[in-house]
């Protein structure tokens, strides 16, 4: 008799793919634009990325450092009207893109949470949650929670409001902290909270270090759902050299949890290449005319248009990974097992029951390496075959679909491999 199928876990929409942050509407849309009506016109692009949710804003009225002039129920007229927002919500729903609203109160000011008036601000947030839930948003984000006194209890209260309205609503909290203990203490009292942090931001050094960070995090958080990013708001290029961007895309899309990206991560948008542009929100490079301040700074291969036409581009890789992440059971909710593959490498298996399984091997180093995959580290339920088919490599030149002998696996510098193999009883 065939073995019984394992029961599928309950899956929320944010479990099924990536979230895409647009923290600065004006920078995202470019010169002379930057409103909700314009963003509506970019939803097809978001659909092409196969992202499941858009984390938007903040877009509320906020006069820098002035609580009285901060209204979480009102959209800043520079971004548009409530009607524009409703229209954006409707269009996004039609395209199966959920909208998460950032309600970080004092986003234009020095302290995001007006440190001296915590209770006033907390009440404003509570009212805002109820108002925007009624308006149809799918969730909320609050950032810089390390600046919020008694963050855990406030988050628990806001989580109750959000989940009380519907189990299908999400609360995301962001912190600049990279300290695991601080992160765990925030998670402890908030069961379904999705937390973005700087935990992985210094992981770029070696495969061993990244492996230990990831496994420590997963062990510490047990069976709760995680999110993966390098920070609560910033671009990957703020932390990574260009040669590691592909590797990190592959990793973030294949770890167990929700990958969270900032606009521009899909093309390797880098503020440092655009003199004068703010590190936290450089202008999005749609095409070569997107940065007219210094035209010579932008070449076609840095833009959405140029990369869309190149199957070997970072954007093309992002789209492929996003597609795989949203349709393969083993990547959607499969078990995770990291194992040794040799110095400089990080490797793991994702598997779910009798579904197709995935092997990820990442070379963080700047020299080519032979992978010594230590299958003995793996439980019987996740054993390695002799060969696996190459689904994709982060580097050009490999023949996709071809079977690779796992004992003879060699990786180029900064190369990541995604391999697939069938379940074997």
């Amino acid at each position: 008799r065939a073995p019984r199928c394992r029961e599928l876990p309950a899956q929320k929409w944010w479990h099924t793919g990536a979230l895409y942050r647009i923290g600065d509407l004006q920078a995202f849309q470019g010169h002379g634009a930057g409103n909700l009506a314009g963003l509506k016109g970019r939803l097809d692009y978001l659909s092409s990325l196969k992202v499941k949710g858009l984390v938007l804003g903040p877009i509320h009225k906020n006069q820098k450092d002035d609580v009285a002039q901060t209204d979480l129920l009102q959209i800043d007229p520079n971004f548009g009207s409530k009607e524009d927002f409703d229209s954006l919500l409707q269009s996004a729903k039609k395209k199966s893109i959920r909208v998460i609203l950032d309600l970080t109160p004092n986003y234009r000011g020095e302290n995001s949470w007006f440190s001296t008036q915590v209770d006033t601000v907390a009440t404003k947030v509570k009212d805002a949650l109820e108002f925007w839930l009624q308006a149809g948003v799918d969730g909320f984000q609050v950032r810089d929670i390390e600046n919020l006194k008694d963050a855990s209890s406030f988050l628990a209260e806001w989580q109750n409001i959000t989940k009380g309205f519907s189990e299908d609503r999400l609360l995301i909290a962001g912190t600049n902290s990279s300290d695991l203990q601080q992160i765990l203490s925030l998670l402890e009292s908030n069961k379904d909270l999705l937390l973005t942090s700087s935990y992985l931001s210094d992981s770029g050094s070696t495969g061993e270090h990244t492996k230990s960070l990831v496994t420590q995090y997963l062990n510490a958080t047990g069976n709760r759902w995680c999110s993966w990013s390098l920070s609560q708001a910033r671009l990957l290029t703020s932390f990574l050299p260009a040669q590691l961007l592909r590797l990190y895309q592959l990793m973030l899309f294949t770890l167990p949890g929700t990958p969270v990206f900032s606009y521009g991560d899909e093309i390797g948008l880098d503020a440092a290449a655009l003199p004068g542009q703010p590190m936290e929100a450089p202008v999005m490079l749609w095409d070569e005319s997107s940065f007219p301040d210094i035209p010579g700074a932008v070449s076609a291969n840095m833009t959405v248009k140029g990369q869309s036409e190149d199957p070997g581009s970072l954007l093309s890789l992002f789209r492929r990974l996003s597609d795989q992440r949203s349709k393969e059971r083993s990547l959607l909710h499969g078990d995770f097992h990291a194992f040794s593959a040799g110095p400089g490498l990080f490797s793991y298996i994702r598997h779910w029951d009798q579904n197709e399984r995935f092997l990820v091997v990442l070379n963080f180093g700047d020299v080519g390496l032979s992978a010594g995959l230590q299958a003995s580290d793996l439980p019987a339920s996740a054993s390695l075959p002799a060969k696996a088919d190459l689904l994709l490599s982060t580097q050009p030149g490999r023949e996709e679909g071809s079977p690779l002998e796992l004992e003879r696996l060699k990786l180029e510098p900064h190369e990541g491999l995604l391999l697939r193999f069938p379940y074997a009883a």
């Epitope: 010169h31 542009q277 005319s289 301040d293 210094i294 035209p295 700074a297």
Partner: antibody, heavy 125, light 113 residues
Framework: QVQLVQSGAEVKKPGASVKVSCKAS????????MHWVRQAPGQGLEWMGI????????SYAQKFQGRVTMTRDTSTSTVYMELSSLRSEDTAVYYC??????????????????WGQGTMVTVSS | DIVMTQSPDSLAVSLGERATINCKSS????????????LAWYQQKPGQPPKLLIY???TRESGVPDRFSGSGSGTDFTLTISSLQAEDVAVYYC?????????FGQGTRLEIK
């Protein structure tokens, strides 16, 4: 009126560092990018880099990478340029210069509508 | 880097006469998306900082006398002073802002004949 006022002349030994300040007044400090341009005695103009006073992001000419640091203090509307590991070839007048800003389009092309009076830095043993 | 070359290095012109300074860039500074030339001209008098005269190759900065005009496109540009005045004695620089590093011409010294 709009003006940029720079700190006074400096004499430094080779290997030392110099920090030049530039105080802006008469306009919204964070709305305009600031640049540093130097001019060696009897020579032409040489662009060193840019700072965005709003967020503090910087971009330096390759030639000065690793030796120059541009910072700003929004509370006093002042930008600073520090040049380290000085050598005799760094003897020059150092200017801060405000980048143009088109309020209508929001564009900031890099030409300079307001200049500081200049700071003479002499590097000599 | 874009190299800017001015000619002549120095120029002597009689009062009331026309003065012409040329500037050539090593690559085009015309941006096809907005059809603008990313070129500026400055005047620098002894002991003073440079002063902006012209930007976008031909737009005069406010307060600059209309005897100053700029022309040209692509790689070849000209600054013209239609009728030289005594106060125009200075060094003139062209500058490209099409790409970083921002670069200047070596300067043209203008004197009275």
């Amino acid at each position: 009126q709009v003006q940029l006022v720079q700190s006074g002349a400096e004499v430094k030994k080779p290997g030392a560092s110099v920090k030049v300040s530039c105080k802006a007044s008469g306009y919204t400090f964070t709305s305009y990018y600031m640049h540093w341009v130097r001019q060696a005695p009897g020579q032409g103009l040489e662009w060193m880099g840019i700072i965005n006073p709003s967020g503090g992001s910087t971009s330096y000419a390759q030639k000065f990478q690793g030796r120059v640091t541009m910072t700003r203090d929004t509370s006093t509307s002042t930008v600073y340029m520090e040049l380290s590991s000085l050598r005799s070839e760094d003897t020059a007048v150092y200017y801060c210069a405000r980048g143009y800003y088109d309020i209508l389009t929001g564009s900031r092309p890099i030409f300079f509508d307001i200049w500081g009076q200049g700071t003479m830095v002499t590097v000599s043993s | 880097d874009i190299v800017m070359t001015q000619s002549p290095d120095s120029l002597a012109v009689s009062l009331g006469e026309r003065a012409t300074i040329n500037c050539k860039s090593s690559q085009s500074v015309l941006y096809s998306s907005n059809n603008k030339n990313y070129l500026a001209w400055y005047q620098q008098k002894p002991g003073q900082p440079p002063k902006l005269l012209i930007y976008w190759a031909s737009t005069r900065e406010s307060g600059v006398p209309d005897r100053f005009s700029g022309s040209g496109s692509g790689t070849d540009f000209t600054l013209t002073i239609s009728s030289l005045q005594a106060e125009d004695v200075a060094v003139y620089y062209c500058q490209q802002y099409y790409n970083t590093p921002i670069t200047f011409g070596q300067g043209t010294r203008l004197e009275i004949k």
